[in-house]
Interface confidence: medium
């Protein structure tokens, strides 16, 4: 019976079986609903709107990573319909805590206002003042979002999974 169907399955009246909802391709998201035994008559896939992306399947389109606002970092690569944005070095006034890579929200840049004393990226920095990320001074060519780190969500960084 339809109540036994899974999250992405609908009940096929003809076969009497649960059937997989048609998955969407990269850059698309489901239109209307399908799952737990029911499927809207006009269910289908539609392209992601501007500023959003999807890897396909049953994912809804999500906004590109907010490098500046959320991660406090510069934009390395803007996103498209199929790919998230990639973030680069930290913005001025923020620093990468390289010895603490276990952030469940992704590799974010932290505020210099709360930095430990003598944090090199924040020396002389106050709110909004310049704070250089080590990668900009030749010590590393990686952005904070390219450092090897412990994977926490099993699905990549927050906002990219």
């Amino acid at each position: 019976e339809y109540s036994n169907c899974g999250e992405n399955e609908y009940y096929n009246q003809t076969t009497g079986l649960c059937q997989e909802c048609p998955p969407c391709g990269p850059g698309e998201e489901p239109y209307l609903s399908c799952g737990y035994g029911t499927k809207d008559e006009d269910y289908g896939c539609v392209p992601c709107p501007a500023e959003k992306f999807s890897k396909g399947g049953y994912q809804i389109c999500r906004r590109h990573k907010d490098c500046e606002g959320f991660f406090r970092a510069t934009v390395l690569t803007p996103g498209d319909m199929e790919n998230d944005a990639e973030c680069g070095p930290c913005l001025p006034g923020y620093y990468m805590l390289e010895n603490r890579p276990r952030n469940i929200y992704g590799m974010v840049c932290y505020s210099c206002l709360l930095a430990p004393p003598n944090t090199k990226e924040c020396v002389g920095a106050t709110s909004g003042a310049s704070a250089n990320f080590p990668g900009t001074s030749g010590s590393s060519t990686l952005s904070p979002f390219q450092h090897a780190h412990k994977e926490l969500s099993g699905q990549g960084h927050l906002a990219t999974a």
Partner: antibody, heavy 121, light 107 residues
Framework: EVQLKKSGPELVKPGASVKMSCKAS????????IHWVKQKPGQGLEWIGY????????KYDEKFRGKATLTSDKSSSTAYMELRSLTSEDSAVYYC??????????????WGQGTSITVSS | DIVMTQSPASLSMALGEKVTIRCITS??????MNWYQQKPGEPPKLLIS???SLRPGVPSRFSSSGYDTDFVFTIENILSEDVADYYC?????????FGTGTKLVLK
């Protein structure tokens, strides 16, 4: 620091769904992650999941996947949690809690007062 | 999932005594342990965050120590206002997991 305002208590029937809200005021809503935590009467705390309001990225504890759905509305700075197919096991206080992503650490540091859900016929 | 073993489940202490609560994790979480206080009818309050860091405004009689899998939370010279439930939370990995809680009451 973000302030979180809960929705009112609810008495709901078994099998029904309920949607509770958590309105944030203070710093920019999209620079915070909103977590949801369950506490049954006289019992401990259980983490349900979190949502990043900027792009609606969600992460759930597997035991709540299919039971809870987290959403948010940036225009009103409000996070929502919908619970479906309610049973008496879902009777609890549900807390929303926030974490500023750009301050060191992962733990929730600001909590709402909690929304009480009672499931009874 | 990371399993949290918190002990004791309850403590009956006299004013001015020292309280010690322990949390053991099923896997190494480095120093990603947090401690919350919850008073009746209130939401939890974060007292100590990762790296054994006392939160701003929290009295210095609260402290914690530990690394990897073994963590201890201490209240020196308890006051009547410390009567509450205390929870540990690991924030090293999702799903975040809480300890089962310790109820602190006065003798």
């Amino acid at each position: 620091e973000v302030q979180l305002k809960k929705s009112g208590p609810e008495l709901v029937k078994p099998g029904a769904s309920v949607k509770m809200s958590c309105k944030a005021s203070g710093p920019a809503f999209t620079t915070y992650v909103i977590h949801w935590v369950k506490q049954k009467p006289g019992q401990g705390l259980e983490w349900i999941g979190y949502i990043n309001p900027y792009n609606d990225y969600t992460k759930y504890d597997e035991k709540f996947r299919g039971k809870a759905t987290l959403t948010s509305d940036k225009s009103s700075s409000t996070a929502y949690m919908e619970l479906r197919s309610l049973t008496s096991e879902d009777s609890a206080v549900y807390y929303c809690a926030s974490k500023a992503a750009y301050y060191v650490g992962n733990a929730m540091d600001s909590w709402g007062q909690g929304t009480s859900i009672t499931v009874s016929s | 999932d990371i399993v949290m073993t918190q002990s004791p489940a309850s403590l009956s202490m006299a004013l001015g005594e020292k309280v010690t609560i322990r949390c053991i994790t099923s896997t190494n979480i480095d120093d990603d342990m947090n401690w919350y206080q919850q008073k009746p009818g209130e939401p939890p309050k974060l007292l100590i965050s990762e790296g054994n860091s006392l939160r701003p405004g929290v009295p210095s009689r609260f402290s914690s120590s530990g690394y990897d899998t073994d963590f201890v939370f201490t209240i020196e010279n308890i006051l009547s206002e410390d009567v509450a439930d205390y929870y540990c939370l690991q924030s090293d990995n999702v799903p975040l997991t809480f300890g089962t809680g310790t109820k602190l009451v006065l003798k």
